[in-house]
């Protein structure tokens, strides 16, 4: 039985050109994490394999950095990066757990209503 839950760091609004961290955390299970995939819509961004380490998809190599931890850092954000991101935890013996984070990237000039945007 799958008892675990995925907690994410929550949806994010960020400025074009900035960078953000995407993180998920698997809790309430003793299952072993064998691999974590990061995807956007149907595109694979990166894989963190327990034995083989990190693999970043070639098309994202310039803008995606591994970590912190099993998370992912997206850099040089563009408006087209707006969308839903998935952390997919492959575990044994439980199976697959999926977390979802939405990212909205806004033009630098759009500081609507005094929103606080992230450029860590």
């Amino acid at each position: 039985m799958m008892t675990g839950t995925i907690e994410t760091t929550g949806n994010i609004s960020a400025e074009k050109g900035g960078s953000i961290i995407l993180q998920c955390h698997l809790s309430s299970t003793t299952a072993q994490v064998t691999q974590v995939n990061w995807e956007q819509q149907d595109q694979l961004l990166a894989i963190c394999n327990a034995d083989l380490g990190w693999h970043i998809s070639p098309s994202f190599k310039d803008r995606v950095a591994p970590g912190p931890g099993l998370g992912l850092t997206l850099q040089s954000l563009t408006v087209n990066d707006t969308g839903e991101y998935f952390c997919i935890y492959h575990t044994y013996p439980d199976g697959t757990y999926t977390g979802r984070i939405f990212l909205e990237v806004l033009e630098s000039s759009v500081a609507e209503h005094g929103a606080r945007f992230q450029i860590p």
């Epitope: 929550g10 949806n11 909205e104 929103a115 606080r116």
Partner: antibody, heavy 119, light 112 residues
Framework: EVQLQQSGPELVKPGASMKISCKAS????????MNWVKQSHGKNLEWIGL????????SYNQKFKGKATLTVDKSSSTAYMDLLSLTSEDSAVYYC????????????WGHGTSVTVSS | DVVVTQTPLSLPVSFGDQVSISCRSS???????????LSWYLHKPGQSPQLLIY???NRFSGVPDRFSGSGSGTDFTLKISTIKPEDLGMYYC?????????FGGGTKLEIK
């Protein structure tokens, strides 16, 4: 003035599918996310999902995956929601609502489209 | 999914009263950067929901200053300082920090 004009009420038979439209005016359609919300029994509000007009990306409430399909036509500044294989549980008022940039909420709403599923 | 619990379900008031509506979430609504996406709506019969408060405490344009929002983490409050006839209706909170977005069950503000 921001306006979201939704299509009119629908009476449909169980098992049928239908499409609700939401025509946006008074702002740049591709600059704002469009959300869809279901209101059942005149009370409960449920977020169905959203669509990003400029790249077509979507995010669904898993509860509505396979039930609702969101699309846009940028040339007419119109968002659409297809509702599939309708049952009496789908009888509700459906709203489109523009996203408030940077805040994960909705600022302007359509007037709602009433859908009744009955044989 | 994040569960959002609103209390009370019904709130009988007299005009001129000050009232508070509570909204609690099953997990923190602060994201990794400390931003909290919690908003409040008023839904009147025969109308569309109208945004009152976003980002915990920001009043949307045209919303009177008798409406105020506060809170943090999992605990949030909407205060209406002096109830007027046009304030009657259903109040909902909405969390947009976690996918999917989820609404509270609503609070009906009605005359005693």
């Amino acid at each position: 003035e921001v306006q979201l004009q939704q299509s009119g009420p629908e009476l449909v038979k169980p098992g049928a599918s239908m499409k609700i439209s939401c025509k946006a005016s008074g702002y740049s359609f591709t600059d704002y996310i469009m959300n869809w919300v279901k209101q059942s029994h005149g009370k409960n509000l449920e977020w169905i999902g959203l669509i990003i007009p400029y790249n077509g990306g979507t995010s669904y409430n898993q509860k509505f995956k396979g039930k609702a399909t969101l699309t846009v036509d940028k040339s007419s500044s119109t968002a659409y929601m297809d509702l599939l294989s309708l049952t009496s549980e789908d009888s509700a008022v459906y709203y489109c609502a523009r996203g408030l940039r940077g805040y994960y909420t909705m600022d302007y709403w359509g007037h709602g489209t009433s859908v009744t599923v009955s044989s | 999914d994040v569960v959002v619990t609103q209390t009370p379900l019904s709130l009988p008031v007299s005009f001129g009263d000050q009232v508070s509506i509570s909204c609690r979430s099953s997990q923190s609504l602060a994201n990794i950067y400390g931003n909290t996406y919690l908003s409040w709506y008023l839904h009147k019969p025969g109308q569309s929901p109208q945004l009152l408060i976003y980002g915990i405490s920001n009043r949307f344009s045209g919303v009177p200053d008798r409406f105020s929002g506060s809170g943090s983490g999992t605990d949030f409050t909407l205060k209406i300082s002096t109830i007027k006839p046009e304030d009657l209706g259903m109040y909902y909170c909405l969390q947009g920090t976690h996918q999917p977005w989820t609404f509270g069950g609503g609070t009906k503000l009605e005359i005693k």
